[in-house]
């Protein structure tokens, strides 16, 4: 009796199973039953990444550098080229198809993370007793200066943008 | 017991004709593709044309395409060659052999089709 | 068209001995190949199919090898019944093609 259901790596056509092509080959003709599928290797910047019956490879993915985009891994006939962003850009999506400059944390905030080439800054705001006083991709809240360590004394408060203000002790005569 | 019996050779003049049978028993005919092969005296095996379980499918090498015919009556569990503008290169024993995994698992004892003028 | 080749032409051994016969294709076929026995005024018998799988009915002497181009059937120990001609057929496309065979000869 013919099959109505066919093994893992197989398909059915014609009532009868048929090998599926390996990944990073294409289908070119369906088997019969005297010949096995007929499967052809992927050409050049080509891909199929699945056990497949695909008559077409899938072109590689393109890092347009206009994107800001870069190859991070090459692909093969049985992968995708994957793609990250240039120095100083992070892509804006999971796919990366296109990517955006990173995100400078504001005076107040300081970097809580550094920007990757897939995931923006994340900035978080200075707590009491820290401050940042520039916009900057890198720069961590930094803590404020402590004036007694200097044998000095406080003479202007520092806020989350700014540093302390130090000065000498009044001396009594 | 699965068996294949070729009929029909003979003695043909080159442009003649000739019609082999190939008569199966012991299995469900109509479950299994076959194919004709063919052997030219003290030569090796040629693949000659193959045929479909229900018939809707035929295939050929290049050289016999549009000379030779393959077709199959599963009403009656038999096999044909029809083969015209024979050559003296069509010399051969012909046998039948059924697929099988796509693989020829049984075949049967071959007829002698000797093209001379 | 895949040409396969076989080789030796002739394997002239002794009953007892191992017998080692190629067949190399002309590209790719993965484990589509099958292997066939003749023996003089009789049809071929399938010996091995998808390159090494065994055959209900053949002695486990006979056992195959091999994928994509280069395929072999050994025999262990020949027997005298072993003295034939064997072929390798290809079935990854059309049209189907069988090696030119291999004689396997008493010496």
């Known amino acids: 009796e013919p099959p109505t259901a066919c093994r893992e790596k197989q398909y059915l056509i014609n009532s009868q199973c048929c090998s599926l092509c390996q990944p990073g080959q294409k289908l070119v003709s369906d088997c019969t039953e005297f010949t096995e599928t007929e499967c052809l290797p992927c050409g050049e910047s080509e891909f199929l990444d699945t056990w497949n019956r695909e008559t077409h490879c899938h072109q590689h993915k393109y890092c347009d550098p206009n994107l800001g985009l870069r190859v991070q891994q090459k692909g093969t006939s049985e992968t995708d080229t994957i793609c990250t962003c240039e120095e100083g850009w992070h892509c804006t999506s999971e796919a990366c198809e296109s990517c955006v400059l990173h995100r400078s944390c504001s005076p107040g905030f300081g970097v809580k993370q550094i920007a990757t080439g897939v995931s923006d800054t994340i900035c978080e705001p200075c707590p009491v007793g820290f401050f940042s006083n520039v916009s900057s991709a890198f720069e961590k809240c930094h803590p404020w200066t402590s004036c007694e360590t200097k044998d000095l004394v406080v003479q202007q408060a520092g806020t989350n943008k700014t540093d302390v203000v130090c000065g000498p002790q009044d001396r009594l005569r | 017991e699965v068996q294949l019996v070729e009929s029909g050779g003979g003695l043909v003049k080159p442009g003649g004709s000739l019609r082999l049978s190939c008569a199966a028993s012991?299995?469900?005919?109509?479950?299994?593709?076959i194919s004709w092969v063919r052997q030219a005296p003290g030569k090796g095996l040629e693949w000659v044309a193959s045929?479909?379980?229900?018939?809707?499918?035929?295939y050929y090498p290049d050289n016999v395409k549009g000379r030779f015919t393959i077709s199959r009556d599963n009403a009656k569990n038999s096999l044909y060659l029809q083969m015209n503008s024979l050559r003296a290169e069509d010399t051969a024993v012909y046998y039948c052999?059924?697929?099988?995994?796509?693989?020829?698992?049984?075949w049967g004892q071959g007829t002698l089709v000797t093209v001379s003028s | 068209e895949i040409v396969l080749t076989q080789s030796p032409a002739t394997l002239s051994l002794s009953p007892g001995e191992r017998a080692t016969l190629s067949c190399r294709a002309s590209?790719?076929?993965?484990?589509?190949l099958h292997w066939y026995q003749q023996k003089p005024g009789q049809a071929p018998r399938l010996l091995i199919k998808?390159?090494?799988q065994s055959i209900s009915g053949i002695p486990a002497r006979f056992s195959g090898s091999g994928s994509g181009t280069d395929f072999t059937l050994t025999i262990s120990s020949l027997e005298p019944e072993d003295f034939a001609v064997y072929f390798c057929?290809?079935?990854?496309?059309?049209?189907?093609?069988f090696g030119g065979g291999t004689k396997v000869e008493i010496k």
């Open positions: 052999a059924r697929a099988g995994e796509k693989a020829m698992d049984y």
């Open positions: 012991g299995f469900t005919f109509s479950n299994y593709g």
């Open positions: 045929i479909s379980s229900g018939g809707d499918n035929t």
């Open positions: 590209q790719t076929i993965n484990n589509n």
């Open positions: 998808y390159a090494s």
């Open positions: 057929q290809q079935f990854s496309s059309w049209p189907l093609t």
